[in-house]
Interface confidence: low
């Protein structure tokens, strides 16, 4: 389980129309459910319920975004429509270039993602928890444009981190 180095860049627009960018660094883990690869894309927050779909047909969306999913306590969804691995697959099928799970409230999901699969996803599936997850969700919940860059080694240049 290698460390995933995640840089999140938040774009704040000013009244003049210019953008100010804030970069936050955090760490997670690459799970065995996916590949240990670098990936980058605009963050799209996905609710775990939103990864359910009763249609057999798969919608294919524009490719290249990073899905962020905050997993709920298992009691809140007693009979989930998909396993955590299934949710990761669904997000990738829909065009996610990577999936980041916040497992703070559902730590059992770590084992599910690391059970290993005969057919792992070809995109990274990362999990974060604790202070790193709080940092990430604070940015995501701002509902502003943000990009995530996932790397499997630390960024070459020291990043200036802003606490969000």
């Amino acid at each position: 389980k290698e460390t995933a180095f995640v840089e999140v860049v938040l774009f704040e627009s000013s009244p003049s129309g210019d953008y100010t960018t804030y970069t936050t660094g955090l760490t997670g883990r690459f799970s065995r459910a996916g590949a240990t690869l670098s990936a980058e894309g605009e963050i799209v927050q996905m609710h775990p319920l939103g990864l359910c779909n009763n249609n057999d047909e798969e919608d294919l969306y524009e490719y290249g975004w990073v899905g962020v999913v905050k997993l709920e306590q298992p009691e809140l969804d007693p009979k989930p429509c998909l396993t955590v691995l299934g949710k990761a697959k669904r997000a990738v099928q829909r065009g996610a270039t990577a999936v980041i799970f916040d497992v703070s409230e559902n730590p059992e999901a770590i084992d599910q993602l690391n059970q290993g699969s005969e057919d792992p996803l070809k995109r990274p599936v990362v999990y974060v928890k604790g202070a790193d997850a709080i940092k990430l969700m604070n940015i995501v919940n701002k509902q502003k444009v943000a990009r995530a860059r996932i790397q499997h080694r630390p960024p070459r240049q020291p990043t200036e981190y802003f606490d969000m």
């Epitope: 605009e42 799209v44 927050q45 996905m46 609710h47 319920l49 939103g50 990864l51 359910c52 779909n53 009763n54 249609n55 047909e57 919608d59 294919l60 969306y61 524009e62 975004w65 899905g67 809140l76 969804d77 007693p78 009979k79 429509c81 997000a91 829909r94 065009g95 509902q143 444009v145």
Partner: antibody, heavy 121, light 106 residues
Amino acid sequence: EVHLVESGGGLVQPGGSLKLSCAASGFTFSNYDMAWVRQAPTRGLEWVASISPGGGKTYYRDSVKGRLTISRNNAENTQYLQIDSLRSEDTATYYCSRLGPAYSGEWFAYWGQGTLVTVSS
Amino acid sequence: DTVLTQSPALTVSPGDKITISCRASEGVNTRIHWYQQKSGQQPKLLIYGASNLDSGVPDRFSGSGFGTDFTLTIDPVEASDTATYFCQQSWNVPHTFGGGTKLELK
């Protein structure tokens, strides 16, 4: 802040056509499923059509298939509803809605103010 | 289609704790969502996924249920809660709405 503004409603004769528009702002339009929901006093709220974020998939309730066409223009942040062969039972307030969450339409997260369509001779 | 049944009306006093029920004709897992519609306005999302409060909704509102029986609770009720409340399911296609429960205050 999310804003959805419908236009195009009005009084139409039975058999006529109408095209409703919905201008969206305040969010990344191309990330979300969009829908039209109508409300008639006699029938309550009724989902009529929805469209996937890229516009490649459209869904309709059975009773309107063939007469209604939902479409979107992501470059202009606008969705449309073309209604043909209008019937009296199409009389309703038509709401534009952004579904939630992103990339999967489960609930109607935001609603426009509605546009009234009246079918009468 | 999945039919959602709601009791049509409820009259209560400010400060009361009230529950509005929604019964589905077939199982819908936790995929019930609740909306509030005030007179002359568009509906507004209150709760999604049976129990998740939408952002900006007061925590006087709560939801519960699984399968076929769901409840929206308001505790305590305020005068501004006068409205019609609708449930909606997204587990089965097509997505359907309940007929609404009109809440009036004494």
